[in-house]
């Protein structure tokens, strides 16, 4: 190109279907200058023109020839220049924003603008930057790309954006550019220039404001408080800690507090202060709700179903910020809410659900939500399955005869379809539970009845009920308690009965213990004691309770004694016992000894024993009869532990076991024994018979049968040089070896030559007795040897 | 239990001051801002000012600043207000008032009231 | 400053109805900032609900408070014969903490 020519040809385009082609006017020339400009390819085309661009149609693949000739007062100057796609530019139109808006309380800017894709062709990628900038000193705060798709037609985007700050405390500014990519141009492809921006900024309504107020946020975030005020803000504190301040334009400030802890219930306080006054905010800083846990649904009544759940981690946010619970049945649409006050303990959460007609299947889901989040969690459930019936109520109880009770509750529900396990509890007095279960049909008007027999009579019963469906969920609490004393029915045994002859052998004592109450049937009232002989039978008068003796003369001729025990309803059979004793001239006394609470008796195996044996015990030094109490043992019995209550330690008791055969009763065995033995209580008394130079004899009595507390097993003596009433030892002391003992083992020796003494020396007696159960206490004597002849 | 007692109330003239006194017992004076609020008789409640816990910030309404000084004595559990410059308009019941102990919030209600002192400004 | 004005006047009812007393502030207030207070008579005033809708230590259940932003409700469910007194309400947000000028509740 000559020097004087146009020069500096440039080609852009902003829809690739115009290329706007502009060059520089040759030095010198001014207005009036008139260009031709030839295009060339295969054809040419020229155009006259009065300027220094020309928008052509975008040209197809390849290089063209452009030939521009200017024409002026001076003459003429022409250049050319070789122009294809990869020398053109695409700059998009500078965009405009259709509109920006903010919404305040969420600190979120909305940015409108259109793509005007209809002036565009070619389908085509486009980036988007997008520019937010905070204050009068537009600091840049964001820069996002933002990506879209022209295609062919004007299209509307919208972008959001929250701001860390709240936008009450600065203008905040917006602008846009974009750069397109099209895949089909060879071209430089050049972002747009910046739109004219557009800002939003808030009119105060009052003097002074911190923002933001009552904020929700997740514990650990960041977050920004600021203070828009027409005065100095000296100070920013968060609970009791100083901030340091932010200055934003004017006198506003802000504060920014980093991984924010849990708040209190009430919230985290921040306060501004200026000279004057004071101004303050709150944050809740807390948690979404956690999945509920242990979803549970289960149905009291078939009426109405019960969810319960645990809500978990504790979100800190109550109140209006609390967690709401929304129930939501799938199969039937139907939903049920809670909002509550959110306390800050684990305890479980409950929603009521109306049971649907016809409707056995729930498909349950538990929406939980607060301001930070929501979570769910559903359950399916049979509720025919889940049935935790309320505790049974009005538990009554009536008789049905002696041995059987009807007992009745009630138990609010509708239960016509299904069957119910209930578990009754029985417990008499001083006797194990027993638990008895029975399957009745579920019922809708909630009033149930069962029998139960297999009862004592006369007996106090303590009864309880809890109830369970048959498609076992949970027992139900257990009903009150509810005692009842079955009804009276005749005495099922007659007493057990023991005679004895009087001392003088001419009246019969008849004995008889009270019947235990389980046979007993009712309170015995009083007894009817007959004796019979093959000649007659004779009834004495009634005995009445608690009389448990009568005496009958009679001679020594063979007697059937019965006793019958009457109650209100009737008279227990007769128990009979033979009044004659058959003799045994072969009895010998035993010695036995017990085990400490009772004593062990054993007998060899008599066929001729037909009916019963009979242990009848006393104490020794009690007078005839002896009698204190016996025990009947069947006849198959080779042995028999005795205890009873009124056994002590160190008494002597006889025991005598009978033998029944042919209604007549024959003494067996006589024994003495103790149940435990203990040492003798006393010494025994001894004294000196005789005294020679060279030995004493002794001579001592028997300790009574009181004071042994034992069975006699000996007699232990003592003797060593011993003067009374001086420092010298005596016999017992240890250490002596100088003294002697003798063992007496022989019970029946009642005296004691001790020999081989010195004369005239003073000598040191003692004597104890000693049992199984130890020695006894001692008893000592000075004696002096008498002087050598 | 937590009281509040005033006193230093009375009849006093136009422009001359007077100081209100008030004890507090039952509770950690030093752990809780204070406040004096006033009653025209037979009129509604007016905030007068606040102290901070420790002493270290005070506020007014705006009709008493620069008049009315509030200030505490932490040892002797005491709170005062100083009223210089008083106005017929200043007649009023006072009460001093504990703010609700709120975690750690510098900014809560009142829970605990004295049965207030009468100032009577008259010529 | 915060105004804060109070409706109905005086309010005339009888033990056992339900009253409802408003406040309503000049500009918004934050719900955590909102007091109700009772005073009878020659009695100094008794904090009842705080945070807009927490009852104060020993304020029984009947009393109960709600609301947000400008408008705020203190509702008593059933009129004892001790709640007839006058009641204020209060912003304790920003300086000077300011009170409404009292609803008078009376007996019909």
């Known amino acids: 190109q000559k020097k004087g020519a146009p020069h500096d040809l440039k080609c852009v385009t902003n829809n690739l279907q115009v290329w706007n082609c502009s060059w520089k006017a040759p030095s010198g020339t001014g207005r009036g200058t008139d260009y031709e400009v030839c295009i060339e390819n295969r054809s040419r085309s020229c155009y006259q023109l009065e300027k220094t661009s020309i928008k052509i149609p975008a040209l197809s693949h390849g290089d063209y020839e452009i030939t521009i000739n200017s024409l002026h007062d001076f003459g003429s100057s022409t250049s050319k220049f070789t122009l294809n796609e990869q020398n053109v530019s695409l700059i998009p139109d500078t965009p405009e924003i259709l509109n920006l808006s903010a919404d305040f309380s969420t600190s979120t800017l909305y940015l409108k603008w259109n793509d005007r894709g209809s002036v565009f062709p070619h389908r085509s990628n486009v980036i988007w930057e997008i520019k937010v900038l905070r204050k009068e000193s537009m600091e840049l705060v964001k820069l996002v790309t933002h990506n879209t798709t022209l295609n062919g037609k004007d299209t509307l985007h919208h972008w959001s954006w929250a701001s860390d700050m709240p936008l009450e405390c600065a203008i905040h500014f917006v602008e846009i550019r974009c750069y397109i990519d099209n895949l089909h141009f060879s071209g430089l492809e050049e972002w747009s220039d910046w739109s004219p921006v557009k800002n939003i900024s808030w009119i105060p309504d009052s003097q002074t404001k911190v923002f933001p107020q009552d904020k929700v946020i997740l514990v650990g975030s960041d977050i920004t408080f600021c203070c828009v005020s027409q005065e100095k803000v000296l100070s920013a504190l968060i609970g009791h800690t100083n901030c340091p301040l932010i200055h934003l334009d004017g006198e506003n400030v802000a504060i920014k507090i980093r991984n924010i802890s849990v708040s209190a219930s009430s919230g985290t306080n921040v306060v501004f202060t200026t000279e004057d006054n004071i101004f303050g905010t709150v944050i809740f800083a807390g948690y979404p709700p956690d999945t509920p846990q242990q979803l549970n649904c289960e149905t009291h009544d078939l009426k109405e179903i019960i969810c319960s759940w645990n809500p978990g981690r504790v979100t800190a946010l109550v109140g209006p910020r609390a967690t709401s619970y929304t129930l939501v049945e799938s199969f039937s649409g139907k939903y049920v809410r809670l909002k509550r006050a959110e306390a800050p303990t684990n305890e479980s959460y409950q929603l009521l659900f109306q049971m649907l007609p016809n409707q056995e299947i729930y498909n349950f889901t538990l929406n939980a939500h607060n301001p930070l989040g929501r979570s769910q969690s559903t359950i399916l459930v049979n509720i025919t399955e889940k049935v935790y019936p309320h505790t049974p109520t009005s538990f009554k109880v009536k008789d049905i005869n002696s041995t059987a009770v009807k007992l009745s509750w009630h138990l609010p529900g509708n239960f016509a379809k299904i069957n119910f396990l209930c578990e009754i509890e029985i417990k008499k007095s001083n006797s194990v539970q027993e638990q008895r279960n029975v399957t009745i049909k579920g019922v809708e008007n909630s009033s149930y009845l069962v029998a139960l027999d297999k009862l004592n009579p006369y007996t106090l019963y303590t009864f309880r009920i809890r109830c369970s469906t048959e498609t076992f969920w949970k027992w139900s609490k257990w009903s009150n308690k509810k005692q009842h004393l079955t009804t009276e029915a005749s005495p099922s045994k007659g007493p057990d009965t023991w005679r004895e002859w009087s001392s003088d052998g001419k009246n019969l004592i008849i004995y008889w213990k009270p019947l235990p109450i389980n046979e007993a049937n009712g309170k015995i009232l009083s007894y009817n004691v007959s004796c019979s002989s093959d000649e007659e039978t004779q009834s004495l008068s009634e005995i009445p309770d608690p009389q448990h003796k009568a005496e009958i003369r009679l001679d020594k001729n063979d007697y059937i004694i019965s006793v019958v025990a009457k109650n209100s309803v009737g008279s227990s059979p007769p128990s009979k016992i033979a009044s004659m004793e058959i003799p045994n001239d072969d009895l010998k006394i035993e010695q036995v000894v017990g085990m400490g609470k009772g004593i062990l008796l054993t007998w060899h195996y008599d066929p001729n024993m037909t009916c019963d044996y009979v242990i009848k015990w006393c104490n020794s030094s009690r007078s005839e009869p002896c009698l204190m109490d016996w025990r009947k043992v069947p006849s198959n019995s080779t042995e028999t532990v005795i205890e009873s209550d009124e056994f002590r330690p160190g008494i002597r008791y006889n025991f005598f076991l009978y033998g029944c055969r042919n209604q007549g009763y024959q003494l067996l065995r006589s024994m003495i024994g103790y149940i435990e033995e203990l040492a003798p209580i006393v010494a025994p008394n001894f004294t000196v018979e005789d005294t020679s130079a060279d030995s004493i004899l002794v001579k001592w009595e028997d300790i009574p049968v009181e004071e042994l507390r034992g069975f006699l097993r000996g007699y232990l003596f003592y003797f060593g040089k011993g003067e009374r009433d001086t420092s010298k030892m005596r016999v017992l002391e240890s250490g002596r070896s100088d003294i002697k003992v003798k063992n007496i083992t022989d019970i029946s020796q009642k005296t004691l030559r001790i020999a081989d003494l010195q004369g005239k020396t003073s000598y040191h007696l003692v004597l104890r007795a000693y049992t199984d159960g130890g020695v006894g206490p001692e008893k000592s004597m000075y004696v002096v040897t008498k002087e050598n002849s | 239990q937590v009281q509040l007692v005033e006193s230093g109330g009375g009849v006093v003239q136009p422009g001359r001051s007077l100081r209100l006194s008030c004890a507090a017992s039952?509770?950690?004076?030093?752990?809780?801002?204070m406040h004096w609020v006033r009653q025209a008789p037979g009129k509604g409640l007016e905030w007068v000012a606040v102290?901070?816990?420790?002493?270290?910030?005070?506020y007014y309404e705006d009709s008493v600043k620069g008049r009315f000084t509030i200030s505490r004595d932490n040892s002797k559990n005491t709170l005062y207000l100083q009223m210089n410059s008083l106005r017929a308009e200043d007649t009023a019941v006072y009460y001093c008032?504990?703010?609700?102990?709120?975690?750690?919030?510098?900014?809560?209600?009142?829970?605990?009231w004295g049965q207030g002192t009468l100032v009577t400004v008259s010529s | 400053e915060i105004v804060l004005t109070q409706s109905p006047g005086p309010l005339s009812l009888s033990p056992g109805e339900r009253a409802t007393l408003s406040c309503r502030a000049s500009?918004?207030?934050?719900?955590?900032?909102l007091a109700w207070y009772q005073q009878k008579p020659g009695q100094a005033p008794r904090l009842l609900i705080y945070?807009?809708?927490s009852r104060a230590t020993g304020i029984p259940d009947r009393f109960s408070g709600s609301g947000s932003g400008t408008d705020f409700t203190l509702t008593i469910s059933r009129l004892e014969p001790e709640d007839f007194a006058v009641y204020y309400c209060?912003?304790?947000?920003?300086?000077?903490?300011?009170f409404g000028p009292g609803t008078k509740v009376g007996i019909k």
């Open positions: 500009q918004s207030v934050s719900s955590s900032f």
């Open positions: 039952g509770f950690t004076f030093s752990s809780y801002g």
């Open positions: 209060q912003q304790y947000g920003s300086s000077p903490f300011t």
């Open positions: 008032a504990r703010e609700l102990r709120y975690f750690d919030w510098l900014l809560s209600p009142f829970d605990y």
């Open positions: 945070g807009t809708s």
């Open positions: 102290i901070w816990y420790d002493g270290s910030n005070k």
